[in-house]
Interface confidence: medium
C-alpha cells in the first residue's frame, strides 16, 4: 500500500483582513492512525493553530467532519482575519502514541492578508507662514497589506511633485505604515487652497483615499495699509482714513497715534471679505485741526495676527495764518499722502 | 478565481438601447472594480467603461460618453452597462472583467484586468 501524503493544494491564499481563509489539506490513507495538526510556521517556534484531538480553537473550524473514521479532509476555516494571521501553514500528521509523533506534514500554505490603509491623515506646519515661503506638509496612513502602495499629493487638484515617501517597515511585516513630506510654496491667493494627499492600493479597488489639509490654517497673508484724508467734513476737522486691504486671518489691531502719542486703538470687527479669502478693513480719525498749532504726524499703526507692527504715517500740515484759517479749503501738496490746511 | 458571467446582449437597429449585466458565479463581484470591453470583428479589445468597487468613480471612452452608462449593484453583486443611442459601430462582442490588482481606475488598458468573461455579442442593424 503507498504511504500516506499530506496535500495542501494552495501554495497561497489571499484573504481580505475580517474574512475567513479557507486552507485546505487532505490525506491520501487512514493509515496510519492519528490526529492531524495544523501550524503556522516550521521548526522548534511553530505556533499550534488546530488541533483535531484536543484543544480550543474558537476561531478554526473545520470544513468537513473531520471526527467521522473515514474522512481524508482536513481543511480548516479561519474566521476574522487579520494581518497577524499572514504566514506559512503547515497541515501536520501525527502517528498515535504516547505521545504522538510527527509522521508526514503538507508542503504549506502561505496566507497573505489584503489590509486597507487608514484614512489618510494630513497635517500642516505648526506656525503660520507667509505667501512666498515654502511650507511642509506630512501625510500618514497605516495599517495596510500588501506593502505596495501609491502615494499622490496635490494641490487644488494639480498634482505636486516636490514630495518624499517612505514605506515602513522596510523588511517583511504583517502591515505597513506610509509617511510622506510635501512641500508647497504658498501664494497670496491661497486662503481658499486645499492640499491633498491621496493613498491608492490594491485594496480599495479604484476608490483612493484622500485627506486634506485647508491652507487656510496654515497661511498669513499681511495687510496692505493706505492713509488717506478725506475732503474737510466741518470747520477745522479733517477724516483720516486708513485702509488695511488683503489680509488673512482677521485677528487684527489697529492703533492710531498722533505726533506719536496714542490716539485710539480698535479691533479689526466688521470686516469685509475679498473673493480670495482675504479681508479688507477701514478705521477713520477724526482731527480737529484748531487743536494743535503745529503740523500733525498721523500714524496708522497695525498689528496683525500677533506679528510685529507695520505702520503707515501721513503729515497734516497746520498753517500759522490765523486769518485764514477755518476756511476750510485743502489744497494739495506734491508730497505724497500730504494735505495743507489753511 | 472570480468567474463572470454576461447577459443582455443581441440584435438592436440603431438609436435603440439595451441593457448589459454582468454577475458573478461565486457572488464576489462587489468586492472589485470592474469593466466593460468589446470587441468588433478584426479589431483590438477596447475599454468602454469601468467602475470603482463603490461605484463612486468611473471613467468612460469617449465615443460612448453621454450614451452609456456603467452601474452598480453591490448588494446583486452585479454590474451593468445601459447602452442608449446605439449606432452600428458599436457591434462588437462585449466583455465584462474584473481588476484585481490595480491601484487606480483604468479603461484604457485590458492588460489591467485578471478576470473576464466568456463575453455577450451585440449586434445593431437595420
Known amino acids: 500500500e503507498e504511504e500516506l501524503q499530506v496535500i495542501q493544494p494552495d501554495k497561497s491564499v489571499s484573504v481580505a483582513a475580517g474574512e475567513s481563509a479557507i486552507l485546505h489539506c487532505t490525506v491520501t490513507s487512514l493509515i496510519p492512525v492519528g490526529p492531524i495538526q495544523w501550524f503556522r510556521g516550521a521548526g522548534p517556534a511553530r505556533e499550534l493553530i488546530y488541533n483535531q484531538k484536543e484543544g480550543h480553537f474558537p476561531r478554526v473550524t473545520t470544513v468537513s467532519e473531520s471526527t467521522k473514521r473515514e474522512n481524508m479532509d482536513f481543511s480548516i476555516s479561519i474566521s476574522n482575519i487579520t494581518p497577524a494571521d499572514a504566514g506559512t501553514y503547515y497541515c501536520v500528521k501525527f502517528r498515535k502514541g504516547s505521545p504522538d509523533t510527527e509522521f508526514k506534514s503538507g508542503a504549506g500554505t502561505e496566507l497573505s492578508v489584503r489590509a486597507k490603509p487608514s484614512a489618510p491623515v494630513v497635517s500642516g506646519p505648526a506656525a503660520r507662514a507667509t505667501p512666498q515661503h515654502t511650507v511642509s506638509f506630512t501625510c500618514e496612513s497605516h495599517g495596510f497589506s500588501p506593502r505596495d502602495i501609491t502615494l499622490k499629493w496635490f494641490k487644488n487638484g494639480n498634482e505636486l511633485s516636490d514630495f518624499q515617501t517612505n514605506v515602513d517597515p522596510v523588511g517583511e511585516s504583517v502591515s505597513y505604515s506610509i509617511h510622506s513630506t510635501a512641500k508647497v510654496v504658498l501664494t497670496r491667493e491661497d486662503v481658499h487652497s486645499q492640499v491633498i494627499c491621496e493613498v491608492a492600493h490594491v485594496t480599495l479597488q479604484g476608490d483612493p483615499l484622500r485627506g486634506t489639509a485647508n491652507l487656510s490654517e496654515t497661511i498669513r497673508v499681511p495687510p496692505t495699509l493706505e492713509v488717506t484724508q478725506q475732503p474737510v467734513r466741518a470747520e477745522n476737522q479733517v477724516n483720516v482714513t486708513c485702509q488695511v486691504r488683503k489680509f488673512y486671518p482677521q485677528r487684527l489691531q489697529l492703533t492710531w497715534l498722533e505726533n506719536g502719542n496714542v490716539s485710539r486703538t480698535e479691533t479689526a470687527s466688521t470686516v469685509t471679505e475679498n473673493k480670495d479669502g482675504t479681508y479688507n478693513w477701514m478705521s477713520w480719525l477724526l482731527v480737529n485741526v484748531s487743536a494743535h498749532r503745529d503740523d500733525v504726524k498721523l500714524t496708522c499703526q497695525v498689528e496683525h495676527d500677533g506679528q510685529p507692527a507695520v505702520s503707515k504715517s501721513h503729515d497734516l500740515k497746520v498753517s500759522a495764518h490765523p486769518k485764514e484759517q477755518g476756511s476750510n479749503t485743502a489744497a494739495e501738496n506734491t508730497g505724497s499722502n500730504e494735505r495743507n490746511i489753511y | 478565481q472570480v468567474q463572470l458571467v454576461e447577459s443582455g446582449g443581441g440584435l438592436v437597429q440603431p438609436g435603440g438601447s439595451l441593457r448589459l449585466s454582468c454577475a458573478d458565479s461565486?457572488?464576489?463581484?462587489?468586492?472589485?472594480?470592474t469593466g466593460w470591453f468589446r470587441q468588433a470583428p478584426g479589431k483590438e479589445r477596447e475599454g468602454v467603461a469601468c467602475?470603482?468597487?463603490?461605484?463612486?468613480?468611473?471613467k468612460y471612452t469617449d465615443s460612448v460618453k453621454g450614451r452609456f452608462t456603467i452601474s452598480r449593484d453591490n448588494a446583486k453583486k452585479t454590474v451593468y452597462l445601459q447602452m442608449n443611442s446605439l449606432k452600428p459601430e458599436d457591434t462588437a462582442v462585449y466583455y465584462c472583467a474584473a481588476d484585481l490588482t490595480s491601484h487606480y481606475l483604468s479603461c484604457s488598458s485590458y492588460t489591467d484586468y485578471n478576470s473576464w468573461g466568456q463575453g455577450t455579442q451585440v449586434t445593431v442593424s437595420s
Open positions: 461565486e457572488f464576489r463581484l462587489d468586492e472589485y472594480a
Open positions: 467602475i470603482s468597487r463603490s461605484g463612486s468613480n468611473t
